[in-house]
Interface confidence: medium
Amino acid sequence: LEVQVPEDPVVALVGTDATLCCSFSPEPGFSLAQLNLIWQLTDTKQLVHSFAEGQDQGSAYANRTALFPDLLAQGNASLRLQRVRVADEGSFTCFVSIRDFGSAAVSLQVAAPYSKPSMTLEPNKDLRPGDTVTITCSSYQGYPEAEVFWQDGQGVPLTGNVTTSQMANEQGLFDVHSILRVVLGANGTYSCLVRNPVLQQDAHSSVTITPQRSPTGAVEVQVPEDPVVALVGTDATLRCSFSPEPGFSLAQLNLIWQLTDTKQLVHSFTEGRDQGSAYANRTALFPDLLAQGNASLRLQRVRVADEGSFTCFVSIRDFGSAAVSLQVAAPYSKPSMTLEPNKDLRPGDTVTITCSSYRGYPEAEVFWQDGQGVPLTGNVTTSQMANEQGLFDVHSVLRVVLGANGTYSCLVRNPVLQQDAHGSVTITGQPMTFPPEA
């Protein structure tokens, strides 16, 4: 029995759902009562999911797996793995038995984008040319381990005196801290780039060191200027910091996070105590870091509805506040391509090619092109529908008159993640070929 799986690893973002594709060719007269299907971890042989005696036997893997019951009879034995974790990374084997046996293994590569790096400076005041300063670049909650690059304002790499450490948290996600020691010139810009090698995602930050301005009376509250981009289902850190004076104690601190527009309370800290979340119990502070002036808020299991501006209010003796924007994103799935009609095609026939990509956010940009890379703009209709979670399903329809043969490609772009998902179909005399779905 021939069992087919994708050759390339399936790349899945932490917190999202992944489909491990597996298929077999059912013979005529095949019924589900004949099927025995087992998914297991290749290395340990730990059972993940099974189907036997015409029934889905359910998940044996943290209740996070599911089959596609309506597609089994057509030979689709794929496994859906929900809320992917770092610990899920590895090889899964799909065993199929009808009368004969067959099996194949598919690799799951887990990834998580790194946050925009935060930069700190030590010492951070009264700096003069010739002083040695330590610049720390910190980026959080990524996977796998990052590559870190430093450069100066002219783009020249800085390699000397760099120490980078990467620590995995309980979820296996890495926090990266890279320290650069430099002797200051008159002024200078220092940039840090944190690269995710699997996602080919780069997160940049830079610090320009100039003479410090004198402090004002109010508490200076600092938040990132750029929106925090968070993937649906993952956790996001909304950074907020203040500079505690010598002798500062948490008993003096009043901290409030709220939604900027509606002023709805999100989280608070007062009287030396974390007063907890008022926002769906999905927020947390960093209690161990508050005394150092870190008032950041952790927002768990981000949803589309969380997008918007959050204000961080800090009061010690004086008041200060600043707002940080949360931009929510979700990658679009690899497009599936369908053809209508899909047989007995001849040059001159008009065909409708549909490109469908699912569960992305925000709305996608869709581009069509032919085999030579020439854009196809005429006779394209694209619709985008949001589901209950606010995620968009994109359906783009291209009507073309066939030449002798041709390749038609569809590109679905997520404008926030700058993520492109491609699908293509090649139409020849007979038969037609669809590239295998990853």
Epitope: N254, Q258, T262, K263, Q264, Q275, G276, S321
Partner: antibody, heavy 117, light 112 residues
């Protein structure tokens, strides 16, 4: 001495709105949360929601979320509770109460709101 | 929502005698910060409620030491060691660990 002085009794028609005020003195108004609680005749106490005067942050009891609006005027140290789409079962004494986010120590004298056609 | 159940509903007392009121919550009142936000209020006839006990067992300023609170988790008790005539009114327990904050139905204390 902490004092919370509320506005006078109101008689309202069903479907209308009422706005109750609560003027605070004797403490730093901006620094403490203001809660609102109501008590229907012969009944127990029911928490409506709270507001932080400095930031304007609010947190409502879901039961009142679409009808109650809590606001403050920091310049006069006054908190307000507006309840819309009134019905007869909203007839009650409405209290403001000052304290922290997780408690309330000092109560106003109460404002009687009667809803009757 | 957390349901707070008080007993008894009515408590006739003799001055100088002790009195005890029970309050039970439908869920633990231990907050994520490990404190327990259970309070006791007294509402005297024609007045606003006044705070007696906060965080289970702490007397509010100016409250006589004949009032004491105890309990943990879901079961709590208010005790008056020697009832005085001025103690009459309705006693309420209240939780503010979980939103929405909720109150017990009240216990009416009256002199026999």
């Amino acid at each position: 001495e902490v004092q919370l002085v509320q506005s006078g009794a109101e008689v309202k028609k069903p479907g209308s709105s009422v706005k109750v005020s609560c003027k605070a003195s004797g403490y730093t108004f901006s620094s403490y949360w203001m809660h609102w609680v109501r008590q229907a005749p012969g009944q127990g106490l029911e928490w409506i929601g709270l507001i932080h005067p400095w930031s304007g942050s609010t947190n409502y009891n879901e039961m009142f979320k679409n009808r109650a609006t809590l606001t403050v005027d920091r310049s006069t140290s006054t908190a307000y509770m507006e309840l819309s789409s009134l019905r007869s079962e909203d007839t009650a004494v409405y209290y403001c109460a000052g304290g922290g986010r997780l408690y309330f120590d000092y109560w106003g004298q109460g404002t009687t709101v009667t809803v009757s056609s | 929502d957390i349901v707070m159940t008080q007993s008894p509903l009515s408590l006739p007392v003799t001055p100088g005698e002790p009195a005890s009121i029970s309050c039970r919550s439908s869920q633990s009142l231990v907050h994520s910060n490990r404190d327990t936000y259970l309070r006791w209020y007294l509402q005297k006839p024609g007045q606003s409620p006044q705070l007696l006990i906060y965080k289970v067992s702490n007397r509010f300023s100016g409250v006589p030491d004949r009032f004491s609170g105890s309990g943990s988790g879901t079961d709590f008790t208010l005790k008056i060691s020697r009832v005085e005539a001025e103690d009459v009114g309705v006693y309420y327990c209240s939780q503010s660990t979980h939103v929405p904050y909720t109150f017990g139905g009240g216990t009416k204390v009256e002199i026999k």
